[in-house]
């Protein structure tokens, strides 16, 4: 089938990194600078993505694959393929409509993105606060007074808070 197809369409013989040049009797010409073709048989090469400004080049464009962008320091990627850069804040802050603001008392953020979350309420689990929370860190819950017996030390750190479902670009 491939052989038949290539007899009918000479362009199908053009590999990735080239295009089928109609102006040159359907010869396979290499993609011009700053363009690529990721599949064979293409009649044009696509322009390479340019990572400038808040976008930064993570992977250079080649004749067969597009460039990949990430974000400059102080920003992080949002969207598939890093189609958006969002401002980072410091730990202990959250991004609001007025910019980065410190977490309110009783809340924390241990990352440079995301929102401030309430400290763990140790008493809900019948435990006491072993280490106080800060803007950057959750409280550490310790055993309840009734649990305290000689040699007992069951310190329970809260579950690690992480950005759900986000994998770095």
């Amino acid at each position: 089938f491939e052989r038949t197809r290539s007899l009918q369409d000479p362009c199908s013989n053009c590999p990735a990194g080239t295009f089928c040049d109609n102006n040159r009797n359907q010869i396979c010409s290499p993609c011009p600078p700053n363009s690529f073709s990721s599949a064979g048989g293409q009649r044009t090469c696509d322009i390479c993505r340019q990572c400038k400004g808040v976008f930064r080049t993570r992977k250079e464009c080649s004749s067969t694959s597009n460039a990949e962008c990430d974000c400059t320091p102080g920003f992080h990627c949002l969207g598939a393929g890093c189609s958006m850069c969002e401002q980072d804040c410091k730990q202990g802050q959250e991004l609001t409509k007025k910019g980065c603001k410190d977490c309110c008392f009783g809340t924390f953020n241990d990352q440079k993105r995301g929102i401030c979350r309430p400290w763990t309420n140790c008493s809900l689990d019948g435990k006491s606060v072993l280490v106080n929370g800060t803007k950057e860190r959750d409280v550490v819950c310790g055993p309840s007074p009734a649990d305290l017996s000689p040699g007992a030390s069951s310190v329970t750190p809260p579950a690690p808070a992480r950005e759900p479902g986000h994998s770095p670009q």
Epitope: I47, C48, R49, G79, A80, S83, L95, G114
Partner: antibody
């Protein structure tokens, strides 16, 4: 498949607040991406209003900053638009959309008229 | 804000023709440009992002090109179902802005 559906009142009085809900099915709004509101005015002009990201941070169009708030209810997989002090200039079709490969999934839109 | 200008509000073409819709940004948007198609009574549908990357399921007759401030959406062989409104959008910096739209009419 990811689906978004806008809901809310079709008529709002001037100076009141406009409140809309976007219900997302087929994808958790806390998993990834940014969840946006866009509006289309009579005459077809589109305006990006703002988003709430999967992590809960927000970004707004500066032209609306003093009037807009985007929030969410993760238990219901919904996000919300509140636009305060509306005027007849806010009459538009309001869309919610996911910013994945840019604005890759949109709701059908809900028409809002501001009139007394 | 970055202003995206689509100079043609209407374009008339025939089935099978090649048509190019242009969009000009008020400053360099570094290929961070998307194109959307909106049919009457429907929401916009993503066609192209990063200036030339076709979104999943978009027919290969749609092609995006351009860099700097000048961008083009080309439909190589117009079909009747391509009758629609086409918008460009920059996704370089907030606020993300759209062009005014170009309505493609079939003769």
């Amino acid at each position: 498949d990811v689906q978004l559906q806008e809901s809310g009142p079709g008529l709002v009085k001037p100076s009141q607040s406009l409140s809309l809900t976007c219900t997302v099915t087929g994808y958790s709004i806390t998993s990834d991406y940014a969840w946006n509101w866009i509006r289309q005015f009579p005459g077809n002009r589109l305006e990006w209003m703002g988003y709430i990201s999967y992590s809960g941070s927000t970004s707004y169009n500066p032209s609306l900053k003093s009037r807009i708030s985007i929030t969410r209810d993760t238990s219901k997989n919904q996000f919300f638009l509140q636009l305060n002090s509306v005027t007849t200039e806010d009459t538009a079709t309001y869309f919610c959309a996911r910013w994945g490969y840019v604005l890759d999934y949109w709701g059908q839109g809900t028409s809002v008229t501001v009139s007394s | 804000d970055i202003v995206m200008t689509q100079s043609h509000k209407f374009m008339s073409t025939s089935e099978g023709d090649r048509v190019s819709i242009t969009c000009k940004a008020s400053q360099d948007v570094s290929t961070a440009v998307a194109w959307y198609q909106q049919k009457p009574g429907q929401s916009p549908k993503l066609l192209i992002y990063w200036a030339s990357t076709r979104h999943t399921g978009v027919p290969d007759r749609f092609r995006g090109s351009g860099s700097g401030t000048d961008y083009t959406l080309t439909i190589s062989s117009v079909q009747a179902e391509d009758l629609a409104l086409y918008f460009c959008q920059q996704h370089y910096f907030t606020p993300y802005t759209f062009g005014g739209g170009t309505k493609l009419e079939i003769k």
